[in-house]
Interface confidence: medium
């Protein structure tokens, strides 16, 4: 059964999905789709990564975490009731039938209506407003093969040097996580 996540209309929704790349420069393609994960690929793809980049996205959908360290959690900006439903995060591990598939259920609740306060107070939005003028991913020509391996010393150095990403333990525990390599 799907893990359920909730957001209110007008907020940003966050759907966690993680994996651990064998090395920071050796990514596994990931796709996000609207609808349960099919046998292959993702249906109704909203975002896709390849071995190096986010190479396709649609308006309002983006990865705010450090996807090159395996945080491929999906952010949906300014959700509406129509965004409710099942979403598929698919870690496309090379090999036949090796993919890891995670179905996440998003439930959108109507925005809370609160009585007007008797005096005005400062209000800070919980989510910053993002520009979403893009409707599709970048146009590029690619031929991609296996990407670089990094030795253990480099991985250790990278782990020490790179900024802590959003792969916090509590998020990792609440989302889909898979170890690659």
């Amino acid at each position: 059964s799907e893990v359920e996540y909730r957001a209110e209309v007008g907020q940003n929704a966050y759907l966690p999905c993680f994996y651990t790349p064998a090395a920071p420069g050796n990514l596994v393609p990931v796709c996000w789709g609207k609808g349960a994960c099919p046998v292959f690929e993702c249906g109704n793809v909203v975002l896709r990564t390849d071995e190096r980049d986010v190479n396709y996205w649609t308006s309002r959908y983006w990865l705010n975490g450090d996807f090159r360290k395996g945080d491929v959690s999906l952010t949906i900006e300014n959700v509406t009731l129509a965004d409710s439903g099942i979403y598929c995060c698919r870690i496309q591990i090379p090999g036949i039938m090796n993919d890891e598939k995670f179905n996440l259920k998003l439930v959108i609740k109507p925005a809370k209506v609160t009585p007007a306060p008797t005096r005005q107070r400062d209000f800070t939005a919980a989510f910053p407003r993002m520009l979403t003028t893009r409707g599709h991913g970048p146009a590029e020509t690619q031929t991609l093969g296996s990407l670089p391996d990094i030795n253990l010393t480099q991985i250790s150095t990278l782990a020490n040097e790179l900024r802590d990403s959003r792969l916090a333990n509590d998020l990792r525990d609440s989302g889909a996580t898979i170890r690659i390599g």
């Epitope: 975490g65 090159r68 031929t143």
Partner: antibody, heavy 120, light 107 residues
Framework: QVQLVQSGAEVKKPGASVKVSCKAS????????MDWVRQAPGQGLEWLGY????????SYNQKFKGRVTMTTDKSTSTAYMELRSLRSDDTAVYYC?????????????WGQGTTVTVSS | DIVMTQSPDSLAVSLGERVTINCKAS??????VAWYQQKPGQSPKLLIY???NRYTGVPDRFSGSGSGTDFTLTISSLQAEDVAVYYC?????????FGQGTKLEIK
């Protein structure tokens, strides 16, 4: 120490091709991406594409699709960028830049630049 | 393509003063932003990677911050050798794009 040494300045006529080389030393050439970036006179930086020397995988900026080709010679640790059908607005300094040690996607070492002038 | 817009285009600041250069992406790029310094006649030099990580050997007066669409390069106390053009770059998705540059001068 890491060094990227590029070939010398070139003067070409419109419609011609240019091939710029970038010889790498001081690190394992096949372990890092090599990107190419150009800078027109008095202008900003523009990304042309990258090549991963280990397997020859490339990605090109769509703007240059069909005109640019990136190759490597692993035996000499040299990367090449060829730009064809040159136009006057291709006049620029062309840089090779190594994808970084801490981040493969930003450039920690740059070549000294190769000035390409396209003029009739 | 993702457009990176820097502000201001140029600025003049007194030695020892704090400098702030902003960069805005046309869509969210997470933390996939680098900052470069380019002095006249030289190749660019990496200052900051992944938005906030100072590259090896870069003086600690340089710092980067931001995530999503808004990024900032800060020089806490301007030195004479910091006169240069500064560029932000997104590497979230290719084609990787740079800001138009910010020229920093001494007042």
């Amino acid at each position: 120490q890491v060094q990227l040494v590029q070939s010398g300045a070139e003067v070409k006529k419109p419609g011609a091709s240019v091939k710029v080389s970038c010889k790498a030393s001081g690190y394992t050439f096949t372990d890092y991406y090599m990107d190419w970036v150009r800078q027109a006179p008095g202008q900003g930086l523009e990304w042309l594409g990258y090549i991963y020397p280990n397997n020859g995988g490339t990605s090109y900026n769509q703007k240059f699709k069909g005109r640019v080709t990136m190759t490597t010679d692993k035996s000499t640790s040299t990367a090449y960028m060829e730009l064809r059908s040159l136009r006057s607005d291709d006049t620029a300094v062309y840089y090779c830049a190594r994808g970084g040690y801490y981040s493969y996607y930003s450039y920690d070492y740059w070549g000294q630049g190769t000035t390409v002038t396209v003029s009739s | 393509d993702i457009v990176m817009t820097q502000s201001p285009d140029s600025l003049a600041v007194s030695l020892g003063e704090r400098v702030t250069i902003n960069c805005k992406a046309s869509q969210s790029v997470g933390n996939n932003v680098a900052w470069y310094q380019q002095k006249p006649g030289q190749s660019p030099k990496l200052l900051i990677y992944y938005a906030s990580n100072r590259y090896t050997g870069v003086p600690d007066r340089f710092s980067g911050s931001g995530s999503g669409t808004d990024f900032t390069l800060t020089i806490s106390s301007l030195q004479a050798e910091d006169v240069a053009v500064y560029y932000c770059q997104q590497h979230y998705s290719s084609p990787y794009t740079f800001g138009q540059g910010t020229k920093l001068e001494i007042k």
